[in-house]
């Protein structure tokens, strides 16, 4: 039950996180005009990964896309790439995790297969979250660097801009959305990886004892069963116990391939 809850919660947290990463990537307010020096401006500038916008006090807002690709700073391109990779990985992770959910039955899928898929999606969520956090952090660093520079615009030279007015930019709402969303995706991924351990079949080394009719010696079969090589169906190695309460020692878990994540 706890495993299902952990897996479900991990999925939901990751889903919210990825939705946040998508939202942050699409948002225009990655950087906003710093109003410290001019708090009474009638024109407010803000910029995103894909376009820059100007909101006039009249209420009119005009946005212009960055129609050049080569003219954009390498850092901005890198941030775009990180965010897109994060979204793609997150989306694939969500797709995989849906099929991995313990509460959803798909044919005769084994728990071991679900565990494998849970682990895969968990890793994908972790990488997705890290990509988003890295992307937002790179952009934030770029802003901090540019804030103290005398250049008027962050994207110097882009589109042949004339640098005549000093406009400083500070952190926009998208950065905070991105950081929180990346963190949630990361947490969701960790939860999926934790859930994966609980989903994996217990592969304990029990000594099988067989009792025979009187007059025969008691045969002890050592070795138990070998660790399965994969997550597929492995009925040959499964032991069926017909009754008898297990002691605490018997139910202890032994290292499996999921422990080394």
């Amino acid at each position: 039950m706890a495993v299902t809850a952990c897996q479900g919660l991990g999925f939901v947290v990751s889903l919210i996180g990825i939705a946040g990463i998508i939202a942050a990537t699409c948002m225009d307010q990655w950087s906003t005009q710093d109003l410290y020096n001019n708090p009474v401006t009638a024109v407010f500038n803000y910029q995103g990964l894909w376009r820059s916008c100007v909101r006039e006090s009249s209420g009119f807002t005009e946005c212009r896309g960055y129609f050049t690709l080569l003219g954009l700073p390498a850092m901005l391109q890198a941030v775009r790439a990180l965010m897109i990779v994060g979204i793609v990985l997150g989306a694939i992770g969500l797709l995989v995790s849906i099929f991995a959910l313990k509460c959803i039955r798909i044919g005769s899928m084994e728990d071991s297969a679900k565990a494998n898929m849970t682990l895969t999606s968990g890793i994908m969520f972790i990488v997705s979250g890290l990509c988003a956090i890295a992307g937002v952090s790179v952009f934030a660093n770029m802003l901090v660097t540019n804030f103290w520079m005398s250049t008027a615009n962050m994207y110097t030279g882009m589109g042949g801009m004339v640098q005549t007015v000093q406009t400083r930019y500070t952190f926009g709402a998208a950065l905070f959305v991105g950081w929180v969303a990346g963190g949630l995706t990361l947490i969701g991924g960790v939860m999926m990886c934790i859930a994966c351990r609980g989903l994996a079949p217990e592969e304990t080394n029990y000594k099988a004892v067989s009792y025979h009719a009187s007059g025969h010696s008691v045969a002890y079969k050592p070795g138990g069963f070998k660790a399965s090589t994969g997550f597929g169906s492995n009925t040959k190695n499964k032991k069926i116990y017909d009754g008898g309460a297990r002691t605490e020692d018997e139910v202890q878990s032994y290292p499996s391939k999921h422990d080394y994540v």
């Epitope: 009474v40 009638a42 500038n45 009249s58 209420g59 009119f60």
Partner: antibody, heavy 119, light 113 residues
Framework: DVQLVESGGGLVQPGGSLRLSCAAS????????MHWVRQAPGKGLEWVAY????????YYADTVKGRFTLSRDNPKNTLYLQMNSLRAEDTAVYYC????????????WGQGTTVTVSS | DVVLTQSPDSLAVSLGERATISCKSS????????????LTWYQQKPGQTPTLLIY???TRKSGVPDRFSGSGSGTDFTLTISSLQAEDVAVYYC?????????FGGGTKVEIK
Amino acid sequence: DVQLVESGGGLVQPGGSLRLSCAASGFTFSSFGMHWVRQAPGKGLEWVAYISSGSGSIYYADTVKGRFTLSRDNPKNTLYLQMNSLRAEDTAVYYCATSYYYGNALEYWGQGTTVTVSS
Amino acid sequence: DVVLTQSPDSLAVSLGERATISCKSSQSLFNVGNQKNYLTWYQQKPGQTPTLLIYWASTRKSGVPDRFSGSGSGTDFTLTISSLQAEDVAVYYCQNVYSYPLTFGGGTKVEIK
């Protein structure tokens, strides 16, 4: 058609108070910033104050700051200018105008209401 | 505050001739974000309310005759009436719409010579 009608002007003694109103129609009043601009007899235009669509931002000219208070009632489509501690130099025709156009330009203007401050 | 200085104070031009009005700002009115200059020109005919002519320093409002044109960037701006008509007799004002307070220039009175 956009219409702005000012009212509330009149003769007032120095130090007195007056409340101007501007009734708007023909556009979504609650979506646009509004301005007051005045013109003293035989003089040029002087911007007085601005209020944003949701009253979140209000700005005043230095000459009226602390004496004039700008407000709006969006459900009633009305703009108000409360003028206190009036001086002789506040004598002017007061226009209300809206930044209905691009570039923060004041496209629509009312016909104006005359305020005379005299003893 | 932004101070706008208009020159000349008055201008007498013959019908059909060019009229040029200058407006100088104490601060740049150029906005880097959209590459636009936040200066507006108004026309006030005798006994009438002001009307908008040009916004963004050079964009004519729809319905304004094309003999009116605005130019300039940063701190220096010009309003040109390419061929003065009788109905153009008015006072012309420039206005800073970049930062509050939204100051006006002193105005230029255009008359027929």
